[in-house]
């Protein structure tokens, strides 16, 4: 991608670059991408895939460049890399290009999905595991039950998913999960598809959020404080109906009995 | 001034029911979870459990997970940490924090700060 | 859950010295969710640091905080009397939340 003839890693080894204050940001957003050479440098141009030129010059005498994107469009997403040079080299040649720098810039992250593990059928004593899977790796994964409007659990995760165990008593119930990036300026994903968890014989179901009857989105906490999470008593005490996929277990984050739960 | 009070301190008896409190004031209480950390005599930090009071909600560390009952009332500002049967290892200093709660679009978030505020403490002491 | 391991479990030095506090976690911990608190004998824990590196309102930046992954610093770069106290790192990113067992910085 990068024209410019570029030497044997020995000779001139590849720079770091970063984007501050992320690589995923809102439109709008001013976004500095940093090259950092390991040696004082003339000359930084950044490069994006497809570009005969770079993309950007910057000429000063140190280690490090800064490459101003100012209020950053959806358009100026994409893939980058950095490479730097010094006067005493020949012409047209340039450093080993940086690692790539992939930066997004969007309002909302996709959809995550939300499946049940391990499946299909476990006992009243046994925990049950929601899987939240996303598409990118070191994201905050937010779990969250229906009518309430505080997550159930959370976790930062270097994958692109995380797993959330609830304890088999307190399992059923309606469930949805988004993920959103660990630092400012935060960007959040559309809501999963909720996932409904219930006893053997009622049958597990996903449906689309915004076909979810009664569905309350996290947000504004519920009116009716006795509604924040179906009664338990209603659940005949059998098997949970899950949907199956690899087994994958994590430390639980309890959450309180449901109000109209006096005491499983 | 924004700031947290908590409750006096308590000596009980094994068996006996408590129940401490602690008042926010000088900011928005439904905007920050209540935090409630354990320190027993001569030992660290234990997170118990965090309440949001905008629903009332909490969530419970495992290890206190039926053990204790966390509750708010926000039209005054006071959440509360109760026991139903004490016992001597609940001997210890309880603490109650803030910590910001983070929205975007109107969905509450993983917490993005620290707990900033806390209050003096309450202590509790189980003795027979 | 993530644990944190902090040490050393006890800091001897004397005021004027540089403090090095490290605390490391049992698995990774995004740095926006990790904080270091102080207390003192008798008193509620203090805020000193969080999102691993930014300093709370009103604390001197004396103090600071760096690291991510699974390895963290909290550096106190010429401790002054007040600072002999209990340091407490914490994770609030993943429930449940968790804290180390704390460094005693004591008088040499």
């Known amino acids: 991608d990068i024209t410019p003839s570029v030497p044997p890693a020995s000779y001139h080894p590849k720079p770091w670059l970063g984007a501050q204050p992320a690589t995923v940001v809102t439109p709008g957003v001013n976004v500095t991408l940093r090259c950092r050479a390991p040696q004082p440098a003339w000359r930084f141009g950044l490069f994006k895939p497809g570009e005969i030129a770079p993309l950007l010059f910057r000429d000063v005498s140190s280690e490090l460049a800064e490459f101003f994107l100012e209020e950053v469009t959806p358009a100026q997403g994409g893939i980058y890399r950095c490479c730097y040079r010094r006067p005493d080299w020949g012409p047209g040649v340039w450093s080993q290009p940086s690692d790539v720098l992939e930066l997004l810039v969007t309002e909302e992250l996709p959809r995550p999905s939300l499946v049940a593990l391990p499946g299909p059928v476990v006992g009243p004593g046994a925990n049950v595991s929601l899987r939240c899977a996303g598409r990118l790796r070191n994201m905050s994964f937010v779990l969250y039950r229906e009518g309430v409007a505080a997550p159930l659990q959370y976790r930062h995760s270097a994958q692109p998913w995380a797993d959330f165990t609830l304890l088999g008593a307190r399992a059923p119930g309606t469930y949805s999960c988004y993920y959103h990036t660990p630092s400012a300026p935060y960007v959040l994903s559309q809501r999963s598809e909720v996932l409904v968890i219930s006893w053997e014989g009622e049958g597990p179901e996903a449906r689309p959020a915004s076909s979810a009857p009664g569905m309350q989105a996290p947000g504004p906490p519920p009116s009716d404080p006795g509604a924040q999470a179906p009664s338990l008593s209603s659940f005949r005490p059998r098997g949970l109906v899950l949907q199956p996929l690899l087994p994958q277990t994590q430390d639980s984050w309890d959450p309180a009995p449901p109000p109209s739960d006096p005491g499983v | 001034e924004v700031q947290l009070v908590q409750s006096g301190a308590e000596v009980k008896k094994p068996g006996e029911s408590l129940k401490i409190s602690c008042k926010g004031s000088?900011?928005?209480?439904?905007?920050?979870?209540i935090v409630w950390v354990r320190q027993m005599p001569g030992k660290g930090l234990e997170w118990m459990g965090s309440?949001?009071?905008?629903?009332?909600?909490?969530r419970y560390s495992p290890s206190f997970q039926g053990q204790v009952t966390i509750s708010a009332d926000k039209s005054i500002s006071t959440a509360y940490l109760q026991w139903s049967s004490l016992k001597a290892s609940d001997t210890a200093m309880y603490y109650c924090?803030?910590?910001?709660?983070?929205?975007?679009?109107?969905?509450?978030?993983?917490?993005?700060?620290?707990?900033?505020?806390w209050g003096q403490g309450t202590t509790v002491t189980v003795s027979s | 859950e993530i644990v944190l391991t902090q040490s050393p479990g006890t800091l001897s030095l004397s005021p004027g010295e540089r403090a090095t506090l490290s605390c490391r976690a049992s698995?990774?911990?995004?740095?926006?969710?990790l904080a270091w608190y102080q207390q003192k004998p008798g008193q509620a824990p203090r805020l000193l640091i969080y999102?691993?590196?930014s300093r709370a309102t009103g604390i001197p930046d004396r103090f600071s905080g760096s690291g991510s992954g699974t390895d963290f610093t909290l550096t106190i770069s010429r401790l002054e009397p007040e600072d002999f106290a209990v340091y407490y790192c914490?994770?609030?990113?993943?429930?449940?939340?968790?804290f180390g067992g704390g460094t005693k910085v004591e008088i040499k």
């Open positions: 000088g900011y928005s209480f439904t905007s920050y979870w």
């Open positions: 309440i949001y009071p905008g629903d009332s909600d909490a």
């Open positions: 924090a803030r910590q910001k709660i983070t929205m975007v679009r109107g969905v509450i978030i993983t917490p993005l700060d620290g707990m900033d505020v």
């Open positions: 914490q994770q609030y990113g993943s429930s449940p939340l968790t």
């Open positions: 698995q990774s911990v995004s740095s926006s969710y």
């Open positions: 999102g691993a590196s």
